[in-house]
Each structure stands twice: as structure tokens, then as C-alpha cells.
Interface confidence: low
């Protein structure tokens, strides 16, 4: 069957990295610079992706595979195949339409991407707060108050904090 198909379609003999050149009697020609064909039998090669601007090259284009991009420092990939680069924020912040904003009280973000998430509610599990939460870290839950030995006490939940940069009124 393969042999029959080859006789009918000379292009099926062209391997990846080449194209079947109709202008040259269907000879298998190498893909031109900055192009590739990832499968055999193709009549043209595809233009390589260019990792420019906020993108940088993670994997160079070859004659048989496209380039792969990631993001320059200060940005991270979003979407299939790193289709977009989104700005990093600091830990304790989230990216909004107006830029990086600190996490609201009661929420945290321990990464440079993503959104601020609520602190764990220790009391839902019958536990107490062992270590207070911050903008960058979740609370650490300790044993339930009933499990504590006499004289021991857990850290009391923090009082509502002021937003950073605000002085007492």
C-alpha cells in the first residue's frame, strides 16, 4: 500500500524538515531558514514562531519543530504554548487592571502570579490559629483548644490590621 501511495503521490516520500517543491518537479527540498515542517509529505514549510518583545526563546526552531517561547524575567506564561506573558507581582500581591495591588486583609498570595486567597479558617476544623497569617503566608492551624495542656494557650486571632501606609486616624 505504501509503495502504491508513493507512486501516486511523490510528495509522500518527503520527510519532516523538507517540503514537496511543486516548482521543481516535486523534489523534496529542505525547509528554508526560519521555517519547519513537523510531518512528512508537506507541500510547504511553516514559518517559525519568533520569540520577541516580552517573549524569549526557550527552544530554538529547527527544520522539524517550531520554536518554543517563555517570558522574560518579571513576566510569566499564560495560555496554551505560552501564548501570552503576564506581569509578575510580588508575593503578597495580585495583578489587577490597575497593576499589582496588595492582598486585602484576611487574604494571602505566596506566589508572584495568581490571585490573593483567603486565609484558612482554623475554627472550621475545630483548631486554633498557631501562627498568624500575613499577606504572603496562610495562617498555620494548631491543635484544638481542648487539646492544649493546662497553662498553654494558642495565638489569638489577629485584630483587623490597617492597610499598609495608613497611619492611625
Amino acid at each position: 500500500f505504501e509503495r502504491t501511495r508513493s507512486l501516486q503521490d511523490p510528495c509522500s516520500n518527503c520527510p519532516a524538515g523538507t517540503f514537496c517543491d511543486n516548482n521543481r518537479n516535486q523534489i523534496c527540498s529542505p525547509c528554508p531558514p526560519n521555517s519547519f515542517s513537523s510531518a512528512g509529505g508537506q507541500r510547504t514549510c511553516d514559518i517559525c514562531r519568533q520569540c520577541k518583545g516580552v517573549f524569549r526563546t526557550r527552544k530554538e526552531c529547527s527544520s522539524t519543530s517550531n520554536a518554543e517561547c517563555d517570558c522574560t524575567p518579571g513576566f510569566h506564561c499564560l495560555g496554551a504554548g505560552c501564548s501570552m506573558c503576564e506581569q509578575d507581582c510580588k508575593q503578597g500581591q495580585e495583578l489587577t487592571k490597575k497593576g499589582c495591588k496588595d492582598c486585602c486583609f484576611g487574604t494571602f498570595n505566596d506566589q508572584k502570579r495568581g490571585i490573593c486567597r483567603p486565609w484558612t479558617n482554623c475554627s472550621l476544623d475545630g483548631k486554633s490559629v498557631l501562627v498568624n497569617g500575613t499577606k504572603e503566608r496562610d495562617v498555620v492551624c494548631g491543635p484544638s483548644p481542648a487539646d492544649l495542656s493546662p497553662g498553654a494557650s494558642s495565638v489569638t486571632p489577629p485584630a483587623p490590621a490597617r492597610e499598609p501606609g495608613h497611619s492611625p486616624q
Epitope: 508537506q42 514549510c45 520577541k52 516580552v54 501564548s83 501570552m84
Partner: nanobody, 126 residues
Framework: EVQLLESGGGEVQPGGSLRLSCAAS????????MAWFRQAPGKEREFVSR????????DYVESVKGRFTISRDNAKNTLYLQMSSLRAEDTAVYYC???????????????????WGQGTLVTVKP
């Protein structure tokens, strides 16, 4: 003048099929990648499928894989989208777009495309 004109939209029942066409004029059609996007009411424009200028490389959004097929006829300067097993969530205005010769964005983002058609409405309902 670059022009893109979509056609083939209409109302169809779930499970039905439609074939969209995008007729291009005013430029060397065969030299550019082309794509279909769609926009449902109240939602952002969403990438559906893209076909390289050569026809040798295709890309689809996950939700249409196995149901939609993109193709092109460079001799007729026309891009196609064959849609089958249509679902209610496929209801949208479908746009064809021409890929820029160079873009800092990837193929799934609208910024990669410089010319757009006016759209054709596809409605899937019982």
C-alpha cells in the same frame, strides 16, 4: 483594499452541521495564516482555529477539537470552517481574521491578527 467577508452562518439544531466561508480580497491570500474567532453575547472574542499560510499546520481550541475542521483554498482565496456536532455553547458570531506577518503575541490571541471580517451569526438551538 484588504477585505474579508464571512458567510454560511444560520440557525441549526444541536448535533447539526454548518460550513462557514471567508472570502478574501485585496492581498496575496496564500502568504498569510488565517484564523476563526467567535464571540458569544456578553463574552470576549475567543480563538477557535487557525491554519498556517501553507495549510500544513492547524490549531484548535480544545472545545471544538474533533468537531470543527479548518481548511483553505488558496486558488479561490477562501478560508473554511466545517462545523459538525454543534452544541448550544457554539452559538456566537464567527469572525475570520488575517494573521500579521509578525506579532509579539501567539496565534490564539486577537492581537496576532490585523484584518477582520464583519462576522456571521451561528445559532444552535432546539
Amino acid at each position: 483594499e484588504v477585505q474579508l467577508l464571512e458567510s454560511g452562518g444560520g440557525e441549526v439544531q444541536p448535533g447539526g452541521s454548518l460550513r462557514l466561508s471567508c472570502a478574501a480580497s485585496g492581498w496575496a491570500f496564500g502568504n498569510y495564516g488565517m484564523a476563526w474567532f467567535r464571540q458569544a453575547p456578553g463574552k470576549e472574542r475567543e480563538f477557535v482555529s487557525r491554519l498556517a499560510w501553507s495549510g500544513g499546520s492547524t490549531d484548535y481550541v480544545e472545545s471544538v477539537k474533533g468537531r470543527f475542521t479548518i481548511s483553505r483554498d488558496n486558488a479561490k482565496n477562501t478560508l473554511y470552517l466545517q462545523m459538525s456536532s454543534l452544541r448550544a455553547e457554539d452559538t456566537a458570531v464567527y469572525y475570520c481574521a488575517r494573521q500579521r506577518s509578525y506579532s509579539r503575541y501567539d496565534i490564539r490571541t486577537p492581537q496576532t491578527y490585523d484584518y477582520w471580517g464583519q462576522g456571521t451569526l451561528v445559532t444552535v438551538k432546539p
